[in-house]
Interface confidence: low
């Protein structure tokens, strides 16, 4: 259908609220304002165009809603909530829309919903139930299989004096109900660890990205849970060595493939287990990229090509023999 | 300068219609949500209507909900309410106020007012 | 809808003096991040000017002497040393949801 320029108008209880729903049912060639709407695609694209809210009257049959390039700012509970509900809605982008605050249950009433980007948005606050959409600590399992939250990460004068990392991290292990989540991308967040409990309550995960963060350890990481996971990326991040723990783990994934271009690896000691490892292994792509940062005199060596001599360890001498 | 002048208020009869005009000014007018804020004589302020920036999405207070219509022209920088079966309850000034696009913001800009008045 | 209550509903404070203006929310209009509470001044003849947003930020241009705290229902707007020209209604106003309500106004006169 051609795109038509309508717009409704809500109760008072509008736009912020759970039980904000659109007063009559959309008609079916119905188009909100500012966007492109194709029935036969099932498709409705509300693209740069400055939106402050979620259009209210978008048409009954959308299936994919492009919300990109807006300044939406703050998603209420209900957001999405109509009536009838938006029962096919299966993938959901609201990247670069300004998003710096969402809330409890902004994804309710969106039982279809399989993919959702949040890329590209300041999340200053990102509320524990965002995607449960109820503080129980079992919720009903979320229908999301594709969770995409890359560069989300506000400014640092936003960001409330408090861990980044355990927000998103509430709000991915809330109620357990993201236990069917497939792929989850975090990156470019400017994460300094992962909390060691997120993978082991992701179960289902195949595809997590994880790549241009600040990661400097994966000691605490457990992956043994993640017997499905098929791509892991870790490149770009501040890596300086894989332990034995994480590399048995890794090895043991049956279906694994990992990514570690771009990491500072420090070529010492330390590392003659991982170089070893990557010597055996087939779950790394591109090992023959990977490269030594530090110390300097290792600097661009590649990690295939160290021997055990290469990799040694200034020895720690007593307070006695010690120089300023 | 950021500048809002509203025009189109006077005398009109219960029953009758008013057209209210913002002209807005000194900003990108198409980027910013509008409301309508008014005030009955020695009383304090009533939110009645918004639009959001591109048309969107409008809302209404109970108040004037049926009655009022709130639009926009963006080509024309100007925001509208279509005021219709008054009531001496509707006598008030009228303000337009901007919103930015963070509603934690607050109306950061209003205009001088326009005066209606209800009377048979 | 939300119901914002001003207090007191009159202030007389001698020049120089603190003011406190009160302002309590019938619910919550504070996320654990930001709170959606604002402050306007309206003198005489005039449109209300914003002073304060989300609850402690003072708007471009407002004198220091204003400020702002609170979170989730309980507000207050201080004036830290009251000037003549301060004299004017003051109104707090939630934008956490619609409609937008307003409080009953603080009329606020030199002692």
């Known amino acids: 259908s051609s795109p038509t320029s309508s717009a409704s108008s809500f109760s008072s209880s509008a736009p912020f609220l759970a039980s904000a729903v659109s007063a009559q049912p959309p008609l079916p060639d119905q188009c909100p304002a500012l966007c492109e709407c194709s029935e036969a695609a099932r498709t409705v694209k509300c693209v740069n165009r400055n939106l402050t809210e979620v259009p209210t009257d978008l048409p009954a049959y959308v299936r994919n809603l492009f919300l990109t390039g807006n300044q939406l700012a703050v998603l209420p509970a209900g957001a999405f909530a109509r009536r009838p509900p938006l029962a096919e809605l299966a993938a959901l982008n609201l990247s670069g829309s300004r998003l710096d605050e969402v809330r409890a249950g902004a994804f309710e009433h969106l039982p279809s919903l399989r993919q959702l980007d949040l890329s590209h948005n300041p999340l200053a606050d990102l509320s524990p139930f965002a995607f449960s959409g109820s503080n129980a600590s079992v919720s009903a399992p979320s229908p999301l299989v594709e969770l995409i939250l890359n560069h989300i990460v506000p400014p640092e004068d936003e960001r409330q004096n408090r861990s980044f990392e355990g927000m998103v991290v509430a709000a991915l292990l809330a109620g357990r109900a993201l236990q069917g989540l497939r792929r989850l991308e975090l990156a470019s967040n400017h994460f300094l660890y992962l909390p060691r409990d997120v993978l082991a309550q992701l179960p289902s995960l195949r595809h997590l990205d994880l790549s241009n963060n600040s990661l400097v350890s994966l000691t605490y990481v457990s992956f043994r849970n993640l017997t499905h996971l098929e791509s892991l990326h870790l490149e770009d991040n501040a890596l300086k060595v894989l332990h034995n723990g994480t590399l048995a783990e890794l090895q043991g994934l049956p279906h694994i493939r990992v990514f570690l271009d771009n990491n500072p690896w420090v070529c010492d000691c330390h590392m003659a287990d991982m170089v070893t490892w990557l010597k055996e292994t087939e779950v790394v792509q591109g090992k023959d990229r990977l490269t030594c940062a530090y110390p300097e005199k290792m600097r661009n060596r590649v990690l295939l090509e160290l021997n055990s001599a290469d990799l040694d360890c200034d020895p720690i001498l007593p307070p006695s023999l010690q120089t300023s | 300068e950021v500048q809002l002048v509203e025009s189109g208020g006077g005398v009109v009869q219960p029953g009758r219609s008013l057209r209210l005009s913002c002209a807005a000014s000194?900003?990108?007018?198409?980027?910013?949500?509008m409301h309508w804020v008014r005030q009955a004589p020695g009383k304090g302020l009533e939110w009645v209507a918004y639009?959001?920036?591109?048309?969107?999405?409008?809302y209404y207070a109970d108040s004037v909900k049926g009655r009022f219509t709130i639009s926009r022209d963006n080509s024309k920088n100007t925001l509208y309410l279509q005021m219709n079966s008054l009531r001496a309850e509707d006598t008030a000034v009228y303000f337009c106020?901007?919103?930015?696009?963070?509603?934690?913001?607050?109306?950061?800009?209003w205009g001088q007012g326009t005066t209606v008045t209800v009377s048979s | 809808d939300i119901v914002m209550t001003q207090s007191p509903d009159s202030l007389a404070v001698s020049l120089g003096e603190r003011a406190t203006i009160n302002c309590r929310a019938s619910?919550?209009?504070?996320?654990?991040?930001?709170?959606?509470m604002h402050w306007y001044q309206q003198k005489p003849g005039q449109p209300p000017k914003l002073l304060i947003y989300?609850?402690?930020n003072l708007e471009s241009g407002v004198p220091d002497r204003f400020s702002g705290s609170g979170s989730g229902t309980d507000f207050t707007l201080t004036i830290s040393s009251l000037q003549a020209e301060d004299v004017a209604v003051y109104y707090c106003?939630?934008?956490?949801?619609?409609?937008?309500?307003f409080g009953g106004g603080t009329k606020v006169e030199i002692k």
């Open positions: 639009i959001s920036s591109g048309s969107s999405t409008f």
């Open positions: 619910q919550s209009v504070s996320s654990s991040t930001f709170s959606y």
């Open positions: 106020a901007r919103s930015p696009a963070y509603y934690r913001y607050g109306l950061d800009y």
């Open positions: 000194g900003f990108t007018f198409s980027n910013f949500g």
């Open positions: 106003q939630h934008s956490w949801e619609i409609p937008y309500t």
């Open positions: 989300s609850s402690s």
